[in-house]
């Protein structure tokens, strides 16, 4: 069975084809080759000499036991080599020779027992080394690591490392890899020698499910003393063994580290006193809790010095009390409990993401809700009922506003967005908004992107509601049950580039409303019920138009519509997916491609 | 279509068939077997994925005695610092994991429950596997 040609001459997918040897019938120019799940078993020297241009080679689960010297010789452009799931028993010293451009090496689950005799010391370009899920017992980074000056990611998770000694990291003292991210999760750690990480600098250190007791966790974290780390991730996994006990003593050792960003990811334990618990983390710039349960929500009003707080997928008794002077960014998403939003006091806040919480807002939105006048980004999407009772007074700095899939109330009672002259992006898609007031978008003079799909209009008619949106470049009006539109609805949108009118209910196509859209490049009218054109002769769309989508409509392919069908043919160079433009009527032409029709009509009156 | 038996409990019998062409082997054990009136146990899965499990989610299509419920989407792996360790599993890496589950207080009517589980993962998104579970429920008490 042949390989699948994904991109001609470039990408070939040969997965699970029962190949016992490397195929020789693929082009020399192949850059991406997936040979995974084939029983190759043995790689001799110059195995891939037919593919000198290879950049990505996937050899996952190929039952490879032996890799000889120079197996990859000639692959001087290879940047990614994947060897996941091969039971390697014999790895020659020169197995990886010739890989002068290799940036990513994945040797997950390959029976690797030690880094010491892993022959990669010459791979100077290596950025990512993933040796997770192996049998490595020693964390000693071999001397050859001093050659790997570009290394940014080292994944040693799911190995057998129990202890870390001062000598293990000596090579990092000699040549500090300032950008190294290290993942040691799921190693059964019980000892880190104090001083082992002294004066070591890491970009990221991840330690999840490493400790089988509170005491071990405590002493190991104390062993990290002296480490300077940009981002530290601690925590557990839901499907692994979890700590029986967890208290403030666990994290006391963090006072002896220099940490820029901290994240606690999943803990099967109720956090009650976060002030004491995170006492050593009051001055990190970014603090993040993922999938934890928080009992006392008042604690977030303590004077933490965080600039970014992230609470994701957590459980709360009620919406937390948030009073944080220095906070600039708050991400509070996908949390449970506390369904009613309560005011927060965050005077420095610029970025607020409150999406996907099922929250309801009694009144939205003004400065008093968030305790700030600096807000630039506000995401309230995928929540509950949001009642619009104020038009963003004190929030005039807003540039990005997202309400999609929340239930907006009172949207047509006043000009909700009147204050937002700096707003660039607005998404009110699927918000149960019924447009019944022409001033709905008044004030939005800087708006560039407006997404309002999945809403409705009074009498299914699009009125002149965009008159002030002179900078708009993107407008999505799909799924709005629209049937008619004002001939001047788009007259002021001379900068508009993309207009999505798909999935509405237009019976006919009219070019007249688009005559002023001098910048229009994409017009999507797919999934309507267009049968014909409006009575007048169709004009040309703006000359800027490059893509016109008329697929999945109800074209009536009869003589009376001959001029419309001819007009469609004349637009051929603009049309996308023409094969999905089919006749719906009459029955003998149903399913026929509109462009293949040869309509010769004797118009016998 | 070959049917794979999972287990029997006092009020349910559970089996599954593949609903995709690939039919890559997957081993599923539930201990103790699910009782629909109340249950707590461990789900054990052994599987070698044909693509990375990053951003794994399930589409669930549930049918109760021929009545279709709305499609549900269950996100399992968000893509960074996920709850489950198997979210970092790569294509070709053995996934051998045990997940605890518990639910209580749901009353199910007697009959045949079908649940099509479409597992989608990776970027770009593609189907990882598709299984159709059949649960025959025979309430032994009210």
């Amino acid at each position: 069975e042949p390989c699948v040609e994904v991109v001609p001459n470039i990408t070939y997918q040969c997965m699970e084809l029962n190949f016992y040897k490397i195929p020789d019938n693929l082009p020399f120019s192949t850059k991406n080759l997936d040979l995974s799940f084939n029983p190759l078993r043995h790689l001799g020297s110059y195995s891939f000499f037919s593919f000198p241009e290879l950049q990505v080679l996937d050899l996952s689960r190929c039952e490879i036991q032996t890799i000889e010297d120079g197996a990859y010789q000639s692959l001087s452009h290879l940047s990614t080599l994947i060897l996941t799931g091969n039971p390697i028993q014999s790895l020659a010293l020169g197995a990886f020779s010739g890989l002068s451009s290799l940036q990513k090496l994945v040797a997950v689950e390959t029976n690797l027992a030690s880094l010491e005799n892993f022959p990669i010391g010459h791979l100077k370009t290596l950025k990512e080394l993933n040796v997770a899920h192996n049998l490595i017992q020693s964390f000693k980074l071999p001397e050859y690591f001093s050659n790997l000056t570009n290394l940014e990611h080292l994944d040693l998770s799911s190995n057998k490392i129990q202890s870390i000694y001062c000598t293990d990291l000596r090579v990092l003292h000699q040549m500090p890899l300032l950008n190294l991210s290290l993942d040691l999760s799921l190693n059964p750690m019980n000892f880190i020698q104090p001083g082992a990480f002294k004066e070591i600098r890491l970009h990221k250190l991840t330690l999840r499910n490493n400790f089988d007791s509170l005491n071990v966790m405590k002493t190991c974290i104390q062993g990290l003393a002296g480490l300077e780390v940009h981002r530290l991730v601690l925590g557990e996994f839901r499907n692994e063994g979890n700590l029986e006990k967890f208290d403030k003593s666990a994290l006391e050792g963090l006072c002896n580290l220099t940490i820029e960003e901290f994240r606690l990811a999943y803990l099967d334990y109720y956090l009650d006193d976060i002030i004491d618990l995170f006492n050593c983390l009051t001055n990190v710039s970014s603090f993040s809790l993922v999938s934890v349960t928080i009992e006392r929500v008042k604690d977030f009003s303590y004077n933490f010095g965080w600039q970014h707080l992230e609470l994701v997928n957590c459980k709360f008794g009620q919406f937390p009390t948030l009073k944080l002077k220095s906070l600039k960014r708050l991400t509070f998403t996908s949390n449970k409990g506390g369904n009613a939003f309560s005011e927060v006091d965050l005077p420095s806040l610029e970025f607020l993401d409150l999406s996907r919480n099922g929250l309801s807002f009694k009144g939205c939105c003004s400065q008093s809700d968030f305790g700030t006048t600096s807000l630039k980004y506000l995401d309230l999407s995928f929540n509950g009922v949001i009642t619009m009772s104020s038009n963003f007074l004190g929030l005039e700095q807003l540039e990005h506003l997202d309400f999609q899939h929340s239930n907006l109330k009172q949207m047509s009672e006043f000009s909700v967005f009147l204050s937002l002259r700096n707003l660039i992006y607005l998404d009110i898609s699927h918000t149960h908004t019924r447009v019944a007031f022409n001033g709905i978008f008044n004030g939005l003079s800087s708006l560039e992107v407006l997404k309002m799909a999945g809403n409705s209009f009074q009498e299914n008619f699009l009125p002149d509601i965009f008159t002030e949106l002179r900078n708009l470049t993107f407008l999505d009006l799909s799924q709005c049950q629209l049937e008619q539109l004002s001939p001047t609805a788009f007259n002021s949108l001379s900068s508009l580039q993309v207009l999505n009118m798909s999935h509405n209910n237009f019976f006919s196509l009219d070019t007249f409303p688009y005559k002023c859209l001098n910048s229009l490049q994409v017009l999507d009218y797919s999934l309507n019920h267009i049968m014909t054109s409006k009575k007048q002769e169709l004009q040309h769309f703006p000359s800027s138009l490059a893509f016109l989508n008329l697929t999945q409509n109800d074209f009536a392919c009869t003589c009376e519509h001959q001029s419309f069908l001819q007009w469609i043919k004349d637009q051929r160079q603009l049309l996308v997916e023409v094969e999905r433009m089919e006749c719906a009527t009459p029955s003998d032409k149903q399913g026929m491609p509109v462009l293949s029709l040869n309509i010769t009509c004797q118009m016998n009156k | 279509q070959k049917q794979y038996w999972v287990c029997n409990s006092s009020d349910a019998s559970i089996s599954y068939t593949y609903c995709d062409k690939m039919q890559y082997p997957i081993s599923i054990n539930v201990n103790p077997c699910i009782e629909l009136k109340r249950s707590k146990g461990l789900l054990h899965i052994f599987y070698i994925p044909r693509r990375d499990l990053k951003q794994l989610y399930f589409n669930l299509y549930i049918t109760v005695n021929t009545m279709n419920l709305p499609k549900r989407k269950e996100v399992i792996c968000r893509g960074s610092d996920d709850d489950y360790s198997f979210c970092r599993a790569l294509k070709g890496e053995t996934v051998n994991t045990t997940i605890s589950f518990s639910f209580k207080g749901i009353k199910f009517s007697k009959g045949k429950y079908k649940c099509v589980v479409e597992a989608i993962s990776g970027s770009p998104e593609e189907m990882l596997f598709c299984l159709e579970f059949v649960i025959l429920h025979q309430p032994n008490s009210n």
């Epitope: 049950q481 209910n505 019976f507 109800d554 | -």
Partner: nanobody, 119 residues
């Protein structure tokens, strides 16, 4: 399952009038487009008229424009076709049609009602 039942067909003289009705059951069709198709002996089935759920939009084939009027009463789940000034060439079986969920066109069909116009 949606069922469409037409009525009102019959024999009429040229120049006369008929009013066809179509009653929908099994689901409220108030938001869906509905329409009338016809098929004359030896001819293809083709659209005559169509109306949107809100009645805002209508479409007529050129041959019936000005003579036929399509309307609907969503409260009664019923659609009508008022046919005036009938001609012999209007003789056909008239079918009631409704769109389906997700905007699927011409999803549901009635059994048809015969209209015969004699000269």
């Amino acid at each position: 399952e949606v069922q469409l039942v037409e009525s009102g067909g019959g024999l009429v003289q040229a120049g006369g009038s008929l009013r066809l009705s179509c009653v929908a059951s099994g689901r409220t069709l108030s938001t869906y487009n509905m329409g009338w198709f016809r098929q004359a002996p030896g001819k293809e089935r083709d659209i005559v008229a169509r109306i949107s759920g809100s009645s805002v939009s209508t479409y007529y084939a050129e041959s019936v424009r000005g003579r036929f009027t399509i309307s609907r009463d969503n409260a009664k789940n019923t659609m009508y076709l008022q046919m005036n000034n009938l001609r012999p060439e209007d003789t056909a079986v008239y079918y009631c049609v409704a769109d389906g969920p997700g905007g699927r066109s011409y999803e549901y069909w009635g059994q048809g009602t015969q209209v015969t116009v004699s000269s």
